[in-house]
Interface confidence: low
């Protein structure tokens, strides 16, 4: 777009005719206070397109901003509209005038507010008085824009001088609204019902003497209006409260209840909705996912949660192997369902100081008329490792073996490892490790048996050993999911002492 | 805490229409001009459309000028964009701003440093 004069401020002779031309290669308009006025518009023989926009005897009021832009919007960019903005310095003319709205300026928190008064001639002073103060305010001006800065609760005025009168602006009125001056809370008994049942909401609105209560419900949208019931709590002052009955909820019920109050004394006012789900019949539905697997580790205390959504309020059964469970009076198994939330639940089992024998298939049960689930999962007890034996032995061959057993759930897992340095291991030399299948000097064999009733894995290792020609430290290392245990034995040459 | 939310987002063919939702809690909502932005990938954030807090006056980005609609509902706290004609330029996450400033020239709105609260973003795709 081409403008001409370029602007972007122009300085225009009161009475006086000026043109503005604007040319680009699709339709040009130019537009003033969001309206178009009346332009020549054109397009030239090599296909570029102009309007041109005559003022005629200017005024004060002409002052303002003139915008060149597009005449449509098709694949051109936003940046394709160029300001102008035109100053008509006119001695009849004090402030340009404002709408109304422009005149009351209201905030909700201190942020920065322009107040709009502009003059005609650029190179007036202008200067910002509270409405009954004489002294100019620090404030920065614009004189495209007007005032801008944070500004109190206060009634504002402009004031400049015209020859030799002074010419005030019309009053600002800036308002920080106080939100917390009317404060309103909606409740309902319940926010899930069944159809048949009841809906009842309460709005509630505290420190005012006159409000005025208005609700919106999906059933006012179909012409089914319910009348409210509005009282005041007498115990505690300034609590008025009104009251939605909606008997027997149908389907169409559910939706959006909005409680708008109104105080009419400082215009405040404030909403509050809230969502009533009306259901065909009840539900529980599992939230979340339990794994058909879960562990606790012996000797410890493991919770076991099952979080779900019911409606009407279920009972909950724990079971065992079949077997119901209940609270124990030995104070080894702890049964709570805590309701979180109108219809969400969530439910524990807590095994206090696990023994081998709280393993096995748990099953909870969550049960109403309406509706039942039930989630199962196999809880595996845990146990640390532990080596219970490493032992070293001459067996006739020549060969030297260690023999390393250990017990462990989940199964354990064994590293073997060396050390000939006896005075700088383990601290300044790594161990090495000892049983790779390539190692011609030592051989592993490692059998591995679950033990049923203690519901538990035993790993037996022995490690063969070649030729031993100095002392040597070995070491056998168990390690499963919840703890490693080492033990460590030195082999000595058959010539030498045995020592462990 | 004031939150804007916005969502109708979504994937849609050139020359379709999208309606985009901004719900506003935590602030006190007719006294905000609102405003719609966009940010397209390895852009600028950029003005697309604002609704005055008083009148409800409108004020649009040329490129979307005649084919989106900005309008409130000061009930239920929720600005507006009906988005028609859609192109495949219009792709871009589209942000609901809230501002308490007043200016008298609407054209200050195109400033993203004049709004006081910011939604997430909604995905806006317009395939061709």
């Known amino acids: 777009l081409v403008v001409t004069p370029p602007g972007p401020e122009l300085v225009l002779n009161v009475s006086s005719t000026f043109v503005l031309t604007c040319s680009g290669s699709a339709p040009v308009v130019w537009e003033r206070m969001s309206q178009e006025p009346p332009q020549e518009m054109a397009k030239a023989q090599d296909g570029t397109f102009s309007s041109v926009l005559t003022l005629t005897n200017l005024t004060g009021l002409d002052t303002g901003e003139y915008f060149c832009t597009h005449n449509d919007s098709r694949g051109l960019e936003t940046d394709e509209r160029k300001r102008l903005y035109i100053f008509v310095p006119d001695p009849t003319v004090g402030f340009l005038p404002n709408d109304a709205e422009e005149l009351f300026i209201f905030l909700t928190e201190i942020t920065e507010i322009t107040i709009p008064c502009r003059v005609t001639d650029p190179q007036l002073v202008v200067t910002l008085h509270e409405k009954k103060g004489d002294v100019a305010l620090p404030v920065p001006y614009d004189h495209q824009r007007g005032f801008s800065g944070i500004f109190e609760d206060r009634s504002y005025i402009c004031k400049t001088t015209i020859g030799d009168r002074e010419v005030d602006s019309d009053a600002y009125y800036v308002y920080r609204l106080q939100v917390s001056s009317i404060n309103v809370s909606v409740n309902a008994v319940q926010t899930v019902v069944r159809q048949g049942e009841n809906i009842t909401l309460m709005c509630i609105v505290i420190g005012n003497e006159v409000v005025n209560f208005e609700w919106t419900y999906p059933r006012k949208e179909s012409g089914r209006l319910v009348e409210p019931v509005t009282d005041f709590l007498l115990d505690m002052p300034y609590h008025i409260r009104s009251i939605l009955h909606i008997p027997s909820a149908e389907l169409e019920d559910s939706g959006t209840y909005t409680c708008n109050v109104t105080e009419s004394v400082n215009d405040h006012q404030d909403e509050k909705a809230i969502n009533i789900t009306v259901v065909e019949s009840g539900y529980v539905r599992l939230l979340g996912e339990v794994g058909t697997l879960q562990f606790a580790e012996l000797h410890r205390s493991r919770t076991l949660q099952v979080v779900f959504e019911a409606y009407p309020p279920p009972t909950v059964l724990w079971f065992k192997d079949n077997r119901t469970l209940g609270d124990s009076s030995a104070g080894e198994i702890a049964l709570s369902t805590r309701n979180v939330s109108e219809t969400r639940y969530v439910s524990e089992l807590t095994l206090v100081r696990v023994k081998v024998a709280e393993a096995g298939h748990y099953t909870m049960r969550a049960f109403h008329e309406d509706a039942e689930v039930q989630l199962s999962f196999q809880l595996q007890i845990n146990v640390p490792v532990r080596v219970l034996e490493l032992s070293e032995s001459h067996p006739d061959s020549g060969e030297q073996t260690v023999r390393c057993r250990g017990r462990g759930m989940p199964q354990p897992n064994i590293i073997w490892s060396a050390c000939r340095d006896l005075k700088r291991c383990p601290r300044e030399l790594p161990p090495t490790l000892l049983g790779n299948s390539s190692e011609e000097e030592s051989q592993l064999e490692t059998n591995v048996t679950y033990w049923e009733e203690e519901q538990e894995f035993e790993v037996v290792s022995t490690l063969r050993l070649q030729h031993v020609d100095r002392p040597l430290s070995v070491r056998c290392t168990l390690r499963n999911a919840v703890g490693q245990d080492t033990q460590e034995v030195i082999v000595v040459p058959h010539s030498l002492p045995f020592k462990v | 805490e004031v939150q804007l939310v916005e969502s109708g987002g979504g994937l849609v063919q050139a020359g379709g229409s999208l309606r985009l939702s901004c719900a506003a809690s935590?602030?006190?909502?007719?006294?905000?001009?609102m405003g719609w932005f966009r940010q397209a990938p390895g852009k600028e954030r950029e003005f697309v459309a604002i609704i005055r807090k008083t009148g409800g006056s409108t004020y649009y980005a040329d490129s979307v000028k005649g084919r989106f609609t900005i309008s409130r509902d000061n009930a239920k706290n929720t600005v507006y964009l009906q988005m028609d004609s859609l192109k495949p330029e219009d792709t871009a996450v589209y942000y609901c701003a809230a501002a308490s400033s007043y200016y008298s020239d609407s054209y200050y709105y195109t400033r993203s440093d004049k709004y006081n609260y910011w939604g997430q973003g909604t995905q806006v795709t317009v395939s061709s």
């Open positions: 935590g602030l006190f909502f007719s006294f905000y001009n």
